[in-house]
Interface confidence: low
């Protein structure tokens, strides 16, 4: 039988006239047109939506837009459209919505052709009032924020000044020209890449990169012949042409770009392209593009100085610079990865790496689940998962991998189960522990959603006909309830709910048809009634993550240390709360070779775990730059994982290497640097 | 129901160490994290730390490193905190107080102990 | 550390009156925030957690509202039993910090 309608199956009492009591409906006086709609703050309640029509007109396009808002979680919206003088809002600068609680929204207005500048409108409380502010400039990127100081506000226009606000777009300053892209560091440091001759297309690869720390009083060329720049985590990326040829090579500072290295990853040629897929204080996923277009690469993890790398996964998909790839971080267990390979026959496989890219699996096949004809043996393969590149080939897949970190283990997928991903119509796996394991939870493709930490999961069938039916579960996904929402099915366009999943609210977005019009409509169910009590201590039971061997004492060690959890049992119906933390208790692990990467110049021999010189670096200069100086390198072969916590155990001591390098990319030293003020 | 049963009160002179215990009953000890929190007199509310009665694991606030132990006797479901190296500033009522289940570390105290009066004097 | 303040230090009221009480946070605790009630040579008493959620056995008369960092204590109508000390806390983060209290008195 399918999942949920088992006989164990138990019923939630009552639940249809729970939730019926707390279902809302909201029908939005708009033609349809789009809708978006942003969360203002934290545990606020306060959410915004923006509808737009478009009438395409034979000289132009007539727009008309309206803002309405929700102070609780949406169930009841007000049109707040007069607070913004009904001014039409351009759509694809969104809703600048500010970082943290800070309660702000800036909206972008559309202007007419001859206007000076452009128009924001302004709410620092949470969008219950606004105030117009005419720009001195036209944006061409959305307002964005100083993660720091939510009054400082940064834009490029489109004639490609960089301007500044530290009165949260009160005032503009204009901090410096012929910029092409900037970004906020930390401590309120802004980073941009300028051209010189022209354009920032005919100047890439000859970009300087420029910082200030004073909001443009002051600034520093930190680095020359750029091609881009990344932030990721504490590292500041560079991607710089070579002196000789076309290639281009990543450089990291760990400092703000005072100092520089050279990345020990392969150089680029023009068609290849360099990614950050995550990144931590600790450490970094890069993907590194094969030559030719082949729609895969190499992924690259970094040790904690961002310097040496280790390869990580081979054949790694990633179709263009900016197109798709699967790579997931399941946010719901430390150290949990997937993502996926083009194998050799271009069949597209899905690969899990638990201890961040150490090592990389196939997913266990889910137990009540048959292998498909992708399967060469019927009794042996695994799930593989759709991810964004399915959405993008447009497979009926509504959904991306869904984890949240209070949410411990839980993740939900669509796949399908054979040797490599199906085009057939897939399925919605659920695992509750990260990922080792699997379980068919609901048969074809869905919209799903996590609340209550976990405690409920809710999602509404994919379907191109009108939907008036919501499923829930109370227990991980293992039996589902269905509620009937409205008499009336909608076309359904979207499931929200409250970001960091500790709502119990989730509002159904769609629009009905009739002869002549058609409306935006939401319905917004609260399931605070159906978890009626809170959770007790006997409702959490203690589980040890990474557990796949009870019987050894290292069971659940993962880099370095393992984790207890206090998860909800699957059978206790209550609230976590919203003022839920997830807890955990660490316990450090003995050190083993396996916690340990190889540094710069070794490399592991394939199923050994000891590190050696690399054969043809004996006796060589290594073409390796550390900080843009002439010094000899150290290194005993071994440097722990970033982030590895163990203590104790081995302690791999070989004898120190003195290992002579030549800087070949020196145009980021510090000699080459230079500081003006304004 | 709930209680938390602290030792009595205890007069101390500067540089000593006093031990005040904390005996619960009517719940299971090792599940939930024993919190201590003082109050000097006339002053708020401070929070010193915490014991995991279950593996014996500690956390303590910065001010109280070094100085401050906890630790537990489960056989007898008691909860110690010992404070060491007394100053006459130490003088308060030190409260032990129920946190949340095991792990869920971050609590509001819903119950407490009806508090020990230490008073450092020479 | 995350700092509590409480506002006022003394609120003078008479009995059946609203008492409104304030707690800010220095960064936002989002809702992880408790009150309690504190009478002279007694331990406290929870009364909210969670910013908002009354503990058992706590009269309706007590509200709280509030999230990210600032937050209120609301008696709809002080009964002589009220008159105490009251202080707001924070779980979000280690170390859990208290405000300094509002003391509610008899006007």
């Known amino acids: 039988s399918a999942p949920g309608e088992d006989e164990e199956c138990g019923r939630v009492r009552d639940f249809v006239a729970k939730l019926a009591n707390n279902t809302h409906q909201h029908v939005f006086d708009d033609l349809r047109g789009s809708v978006s709609l942003s969360w203002v703050g934290d545990s606020t309640g306060v959410i915004l939506v923006l509808t737009t029509f478009h009438v395409p007109l034979v000289i132009m396009t007539f727009g008309q837009s309206k803002l309405y808002r929700s102070e609780d979680y949406g169930k009841n919206f007000k049109d707040i459209t007069d607070l913004i003088n009904n001014t039409f809002i351009r759509t694809e600068f969104g809703m600048a919505i500010g970082p943290e609680n800070s309660g702000k929204v800036v909206l972008t207005a559309e202007v007419s052709g001859g206007s000076r500048g452009g128009r924001i409108f302004r709410s620092s409380d949470f969008a219950k009032n606004f105030v117009q502010t005419d720009l001195p400039f036209h944006p061409l990127t959305q307002m964005m924020y100083s993660p720091q100081n939510s009054d400082y506000l940064l834009a490029l226009s489109t004639e490609n000044g960089l301007w500044v606000s530290k009165n949260f777009g009160g005032k503009w300053e204009e901090i410096h020209k012929a910029v092409c892209l900037a970004k906020w560091g930390s401590d309120n440091t802004i980073f941009f890449t300028t051209y010189a001759n022209g354009s920032c297309k005919a100047d890439l690869g000859a970009l300087e990169l420029w910082r200030t720390s004073d909001l443009g009083k002051s600034f520093k060329t930190i680095g020359v012949k750029i091609y881009s720049f990344g932030l990721g985590g504490r590292f500041l990326f560079a991607s710089v042409m070579a002196d000789k040829d076309t290639t281009r090579r990543i450089h990291v500072s760990t400092d703000q770009g005072d100092t520089w290295s050279m990345a020990q990853l392969p150089s680029v040629g023009q068609e290849q392209f360099y990614s950050i897929l995550a990144a931590n204080d600790d450490m970094v996923f890069m993907h590194v593009d094969e030559p030719g277009d082949t729609g895969f690469g190499t992924i690259f993890t970094s040790d904690d100085r961002g310097i040496v790398y280790s390869k990580s996964l081979d054949r790694h998909l990633y179709t263009t610079t900016g197109g798709e790839t699967d790579f997931t971080n399941v946010t719901s267990l430390r150290g949990v990865y997937i993502t996926s390979v083009l194998s050799e026959d271009n069949s597209i496989q899905t690969m899990i790496t638990f201890d961040q890219g150490g090592r990389w699996t196939h997913l266990r096949k889910p137990e009540n689940s048959e292998c498909d004809a992708t399967a060469k043996n019927k009794n042996e393969c695994s799930l593989h998962i759709h991810a964004s590149y399915s959405i993008s080939q447009k497979l009926n897949v509504p959904m991306a991998p869904l984890s949240e970190p209070n949410a411990v283990g839980i993740v939900i997928a669509h796949g399908s189960v054979g040797d490599a991903i199906s085009v057939m119509v897939p399925d919605v796996y659920i695992s509750d522990d990260g990922g080792y394991s699997w379980t068919k939870m609901l048969e074809g493709p869905h919209y799903y959603t996590i609340l209550d930490s976990g405690g409920i999961i809710v999602a509404i069938e994919h379907s191109s006909r009108p939907i008036n039916v919501i499923k829930f579960s109370t227990d991980e996904g293992q039996c589902w309830q269905t509620y009937t929402f409205t008499r009336d099915p909608i076309y359904f366009t979207g499931l929200a709910s409250e970001p960091g999943a500790r709502s119990m609210n989730i509002s159904i977005w769609g629009f009905t048809e009739s002869f002549l019009t058609s409306q935006w409509v939401s319905y917004t169910i609260d399931f605070k009634d159906i978890l009626e009590r809170n959770c007790e201590e006997k409702d959490y039971t203690i589980w040890l993550a990474h557990s796949t061997d009870p019987e050894d004492y290292e069971d659940g060690c993962i880099l370095g240390y393992k984790e207890q959890f206090l998860r909800l049992r699957k059978s206790s119906v209550c609230q976590n709360g919203r003022d839920y933390v997830v807890t955990k208790q660490p316990s450090i692990c003995l050190c083993s070779l396996e916690d340990f990467l190889c540094d710069f110049g070794y490399y592991r021999p394939e199923n050994d775990s000891k590190c050696v010189e690399q054969p043809e670096l004996k006796g060589h200069d290594l073409e390796f730059c550390l900080y843009g100086r002439e010094e000899h390198l150290t290194t005993n072969g071994y440097r722990k994982i970033p982030g590895d916590k163990c203590q104790g155990g081995v302690n791999p001591v070989r004898e120190v290497k003195d290992l002579k390098k030549k800087c070949t990319s020196n145009f980021l030293s510090p000699e080459k640097q230079n500081s003006k003020s304004n | 129901q709930v209680q938390l049963v602290q030792s009595g009160a205890e007069v101390k002179k500067p540089g000593a160490s006093v031990k005040v215990s904390c005996k619960a009953s009517?719940?299971?000890?090792?599940?939930?994290?024993m919190h201590w929190v003082r109050q000097a007199p006339g002053q708020g509310l401070e929070w010193m730390g915490w014991?995991?009665?279950?593996?014996?694991?500690?956390n303590y606030a910065q001010k109280f490193q070094g100085r401050v132990t906890m630790t537990r006797d489960t056989s007898i479901s008691t909860a110690y905190m010992e404070l060491s190296r007394l100053r006459s500033d130490d003088t308060a009522v030190y409260y032990c107080?129920?946190?949340?289940?095991?792990?869920?570390?971050?609590?509001?105290?819903?119950?407490w102990g009806q508090g020990t009066l230490v008073t450092v004097s020479s | 550390e995350i700092v509590m303040t409480q506002s006022p230090a003394t609120l003078s009221v008479s009995p059946g009156e609203r008492a409104t009480l304030s707690c800010r946070a220095s960064?936002?605790?989002?809702?992880?925030l408790a009150w309690y009630q504190q009478k002279p040579g007694q331990a406290p008493r929870l009364l909210i957690y969670?910013?908002?959620t009354r503990a058992t056995g706590i009269p309706a008369r007590f509200s709280g509202s509030g999230s990210g960092t600032e937050f209120t204590l609301t008696i709809s109508s002080l009964q002589s039993e009220d008159f105490a000390v009251y202080y707001c806390?924070?779980?979000?983060?280690?170390?859990?910090?208290f405000g300094g209290g509002t003391k509610v008195e008899i006007k």
């Open positions: 806390q924070q779980f979000r983060v280690l170390p859990p910090t």
């Open positions: 960064q936002s605790v989002s809702s992880n």
């Open positions: 969670g910013a908002s």
């Open positions: 009517g719940y299971t000890f090792t599940g939930y994290y």
């Open positions: 107080a129920r946190g949340g289940p095991q792990l869920r570390v971050a609590e509001y105290f819903q119950h």
């Open positions: 014991i995991n009665p279950n593996s014996g694991g500690t």
